[in-house]
Structures are given as C-alpha cells and as structure tokens.
C-alpha cells in the first residue's frame, strides 16, 4: 500500500509531460493575487525642510491578478533531467477587490530625485543633476497615481538628462510583457528529491550579487518542494523579487480545505544581522547605512536594480531594528499580517496556499550638491509600499487533491 | 603621481578652429571630471565646461557653449577640447583641471595642466 | 550665473601681517567657496575646499569663513613665498564662477 503510494507520488511529482504535477506546473490553478499598500506621506515639506521624521500613512489595498500567465519557452533536457522555462509577468487591475482606482494620487518619494545621487556619487555631476532637477521643478517628493508608481511614468528631471538614460520610473517597472528566467529547474526524473530546485538562473548558478555563499542560488521558486517533506527540514527557495535565496522553518500544522498541511514561515534570523546570526554576513555589502553591519530587517539589493538605492523589508518593518524604523512614523508592524508563510502539503511537497509580503524601500541620503536634498540632516530608508501576493487551491482543486492524494493515504 | 599635459602652445587665424589635448597619468581617469579654464592675459579666470569621463555628461557655461567642444578618449586617457570660429578675443591661457570626490570632501580642479597658449592672429 | 565680487584687487604687506581678502557672491551659495593661489607663470593651486577645507599639504597660516553670500580669505603671517594672484571660486550652482582676482605683493 504504501509502497504503492510513494511510487505514485514520485511518478506525479516529475515535471514532464503528462504528470499531475507538470499540469499545474506550467500554468497555476490557483488564482493568485498582488495587494498593494501605498505609503502616503502626510509631511512632505515639514522633511525637506527641516529633515522631520516622516509621517506615512498605508493607502489600500490595491489588488491585481498576478501569475495568470503559462511557463514559456519550456523545454526538456534529458541529458541533464533538467527542464527550463521564462515566467511572463502580467498584472490585472481588480476594481472589485480595491479600495480605489488606479487613478488614486499619492505623495511618495521622487524616486529619481532620491536615486541620481546614489548613482552619481559624482560632485560634478550631481551639480549638473541639480540645475536639471530645478529645471523640471522636481522635489525630495511628488504626487503620483497609483498605476503610475507601480508600473512607470516619465520622470520630468531625468527627461532633461543629456546623455542617453532610462527616463521611465517606476516601482516595478517595466512588468507587463516582460519575463523572469530563463530558469533551469531539475525535472526529478533521475532524482526525485531534487524536483523542481533551480539549477541555475539566467544561466548562472550564481545571482553575482552577493559576496560568498550569499551568492548561491538555493533551492526551488517555492510553488513546490520535493516530496515527503518532514517538519524538521528547511526549505530553501529563490525568490527573484528580493534577489537572494532564502529558507523556511516549519511553524504550524493547519487544516486546508480538508488537506493536512505544514504552514512554514520566515523566520526572523533570516532578517538578522551578522551580530545576531553569522550566516549574513555576506548580506551585509556595505557599512555605513547598516551602521557596520548591526543594522537588522532590511536588505540592500541596490547591485540587483543597477545601483538604485531599494532596500527590501518585511511590511512595516517587522523584524527590523529601531534605527531602521525610528525616523519613520505610522507604521504598525504585526507578525500575523505582515509575514510570509507557505502551507505545503508534505507528501507532493506542493505548496498548496502561500502569503508573500514584501515591503520595497528607497534609500534617501542628505546630498550637498542637491537642493532638494540638502537639508537632510541623516538618511532614511523610504518605505514606498507593501504588498501581500496570496494564492490558495481552489475548492475544486482541493477536493481532487483529497480524491487523489491525501484520500488514498488515508 | 596625478599629471596632466597640455599640448604645445597653437597660432591660429581668425575664424580657424583648433583641438587642445591633455593626457592624464597616475589616476583613474574615468573616475576624475576634467574641466577646462580660459585666463585671458592678465586677467581672471572663467570656467568653459566640464566633462565626466565615466558617462560622457557634460556641462558647459553658457557663454562658451558655441565655442568649446569637450570629449575624452578613454582608450589613452586624454580629453580634449576644440574651439571653433576662433576671434582675437579668444587668445588666452586654457587650462585643463581634474578633480576626485570620493570620499575626499569636495575639492574642486584639484589637478591642473601646465596650459596652452592659443594666440589668434592674422 | 552666481557674479562673485572680489576685493581687493590688489594688495602690498610686509612679511608677518595679516591679509584678507574678501569675495561677495550674488546668490546664497552656503559654504560652497574655494580659494586658490596662482603664483607667476604657473597654473591656480587649490589652497581651501568648499566648507572651508584646508586642503593637504597647505600651510595652516591659510584660512577662510563664511557662508551664505560672504567669504572671507586669510594669511596670517604673510611670507616672501605667499606672493602670487589669489582667485575664489563659487562651486554651488553652474556656470562656476570665478572672483576677479587679488594680487598680493610684498613691500
């Protein structure tokens, strides 16, 4: 019987075609959804001004259909058991599911205002910068719609720019028709314990991001995990959106729709710093904003966006340190809402319900030789916005699963 | 050690045009902003432009922006500036100046040329 | 443009005084003032950085003050070697702009 099982389990669990697992590989049944919370800041001149702490209100949510889209380019190689994809990316707006409209106005970070002399460290250069950003009538802040900020406006300083730069802005831009990959996963086939953990990732084994070990490209892309996963294992997955390897700890057993899972969560040592766990030390890439590496719950991923100055962090800037959060005012940080978890159910290892929240920042440093920025007296990392991207088996999925699955072990 | 040479002294004629050099040594020239200065004899200085090597961004002040053309070869490390439609009131003294920020507060044209002495004359 | 108005434009102490020379920009540039030297047949040498930075290397007797729109040059202690044309530069805004110029000499 429960030879029978296993055996059945490592047949469906191989990506190839015609397995169960393949099926919902290529295109996810779930139906998954983005929420965004916009940081609203309620005192911009009072910071320009006087370097204030800054006083942010959440805005939203604002939700879009995210991962509606198949695999692309998928193709097997059996010599290595591997199979290789791009994931299109694409966002629908769900009026339903907001509480506004894609037009709704924010006052948030000039996102270029705030970035060029993170960019160019260059005096010279920076004067240059300035006369351009009072020209455009630019400031430390702007209003912008919310379609705007997520997905990228033309930014009137860097319009006037005279050498050839990207002069679109936007949290995410460009999304829409643009892919994440190409990824090379193993297809189990030859070694079922190493389904679906990514071999390389736009033909690396290494992001080249990161220092050392930091560097490598772990585990699976967490929509599934190698099968009869036990509660003592860690997972360990890439995410792309925070351009690192990160892991999970098992947490809790939870009922889903009738199917045992394991809720695994983020712990908070993966946000540590190197005083607290040792391991990221090679997170840490620069000294003077993390206060020589004691900084803790953010993670500076400026050589994964061309030198922009995002930091990513949990929402709310759960799990950082007070001088992370200290000059920010409004923010609620709360274990429940803001941290990530995937249920897995552990015989397929298929992650059957997940939450991911992220919160993108933007560094902002006093800058002499800019007017906008000059009167800052300390630097602040810029919360912008938080987003919640949940995706759950459906009913009818679910009962098949039980059918199929959980059914027969039972 | 920071050098910069200036190429030879240049007689022009009116409404001619001519190319000064200044070859860079001891630094990483994409790093560094070269400047470049007019002196009129015995007279005080005044800023043409200024280009960053790293991008190729420049700045000019407005009065020389008709006048003087900056560009760099980082290939060999030297910029360069061409003035055209050259006028007696063009006869000066051009220097070339460097300057690195990093780090370093903010000390502007911190490295000159010997200059070059451009005399427009029929 | 920033106009920076330069005064003296010339100027004749003994060895041992004090020379001061002053430069009035017409825009509010804060602390972005520089000073520099240019002795006979030789090009300007950066003396003092904006913020009123003395640069490496340059004798302590050199110092400079202010902010805003009013910057002050100073020599204590002028030596036989000090004599030379000193020029202050507004480093805030484009065009940079120069001063017009103050020759020391000594009696």
């Known amino acids: 019987g429960d030879m029978l099982i296993e055996k059945t389990i490592k047949r469906e669990v191989v990506l190839e075609e015609g397995t169960t697992a393949f099926k919902n590989w290529v295109k996810t049944g779930t139906t998954v959804y983005r929420q965004f919370w916009i940081f609203d800041v309620q005192n911009p001149d009072d910071v320009a001004k006087n370097s204030s702490k800054i006083k942010v209100k959440q805005r939203g949510p604002y939700t879009y259909r995210v991962r509606y889209l198949a695999k692309e380019n998928i193709t097997q190689d059996p010599e290595d058991h591997t199979v290789s994809f791009v994931q299109p990316n694409g966002a629908i707006f769900e009026p339903s599911l907001s509480v506004g409209t894609e037009d709704d106005n924010f006052t948030v970070l000039n996102l270029a205002v705030a970035a060029a002399p993170h960019i160019y460290q260059n005096s010279f250069v920076q004067v240059v910068l300035n006369s351009l950003i009072k020209k455009s009538k630019s400031s430390m802040f702007q209003t912008r719609s919310l379609k705007e900020l997520l997905w990228g406006y033309k930014d009137p300083f860097l319009s006037l720019v005279p050498y050839p730069i990207s002069t679109t802005v936007g949290v995410f831009y460009p999304y829409n028709d643009t892919v994440d990959g190409v990824y090379k996963v193993f297809n189990g086939k030859d070694n079922i314990s190493k389904v679906a953990i990514i071999e390389s990732y736009k033909g690396k084994r290494n992001l080249s991001y990161w220092p050392s070990y930091c560097d490598m490209i772990n585990g699976t892309d967490a929509a599934s995990f190698p099968p009869f996963v036990e509660k003592s294992r860690t997972l360990r997955f890439f995410s792309s959106d925070i351009c690192r390897s990160i892991y999970a700890v098992f947490g809790s057993e939870i009922d889903l729709k009738g199917i045992p899972v394991y809720r695994f969560v983020l712990p908070a040592n993966a946000f540590a710093s190197p005083l607290q766990n040792p391991d990221n030390h090679c997170f840490c890439t620069e000294k003077v904003i993390s206060n020589n590496c004691t900084s803790y719950g953010v993670l500076d991923i400026g050589k994964c966006k061309e030198g922009k100055p995002v930091y990513i962090s949990l929402p709310h800037f759960l799990h950082a340190s007070p001088d992370v959060s200290e000059p920010i005012e409004g923010l609620h940080p709360n274990e429940d809402e803001h941290r990530t978890y995937l249920d897995v159910e552990p015989i397929t290892g298929f992650t059957l319900q997940f939450a991911k929240r992220l919160q993108v920042n933007i560094l902002v440093k006093p800058a002499r030789k800019i007017e906008a920025l000059k009167n800052l007296k300390r630097p602040y990392i810029v919360p912008i916005l938080w987003l919640n991207e949940t995706g759950t088996i459906g009913d009818e999925k679910a009962e098949m699963f039980k059918t199929q699955v959980t059914g027969k072990i039972k | 050690e920071v050098q910069l040479q200036q190429s030879g002294p240049e007689l022009v004629k009116p409404g001619a045009s001519v190319k000064i050099s200044c070859k860079t040594s001891?630094?990483?020239?994409?790093?560094?902003?070269m400047h470049w200065v007019k002196q009129s004899h015995g007279k005080s200085l005044e800023w043409i432009g200024g280009i960053y090597p790293y991008n190729g961004g420049t700045a000019y002040n407005q009065k020389f922006k008709n006048k003087a053309t900056l560009t760099v070869d980082i290939s060999s490390n030297t910029a360069y500036m061409a003035l055209r439609s050259l006028a007696s009131d063009d006869s000066a003294v051009y220097y070339c100046?460097?300057?690195?920020?990093?780090?370093?507060?903010?000390?502007?044209?911190?490295?000159w040329g010997q200059g070059t002495l451009v005399t427009v004359s029929a | 443009e920033t106009t920076v108005t330069q005064s003296p434009a010339s100027l004749s102490v003994a060895t041992g005084e004090k020379v001061t020379i002053r430069c009035i920009t017409s825009t509010d540039i804060d602390d972005d003032m520089n000073w520099y030297q240019q002795r006979p047949g030789e090009p300007p040498n950066l003396l003092i950085s904006?913020?009123?930075t003395l640069r490496p290397g340059v004798p302590s007797r050199f110092s400079s003050s202010g902010y805003g729109t009013d910057f002050v040059f100073t020599i204590e202690n002028t030596l036989s070697e000090d004599v030379a044309d000193y020029y202050c530069?507004?480093?805030?805004?484009?065009?940079?702009?120069f001063g017009s110029g103050t020759r020391l000499e000594i009696k």
């Open positions: 001891g630094y990483t020239f994409t790093e560094y902003t």
């Open positions: 530069l507004q480093s805030d805004n484009l065009p940079f702009t």
């Open positions: 100046a460097s300057d690195y920020f990093y780090g370093d507060g903010y000390p502007w044209f911190t490295y």
């Open positions: 904006e913020g009123n």
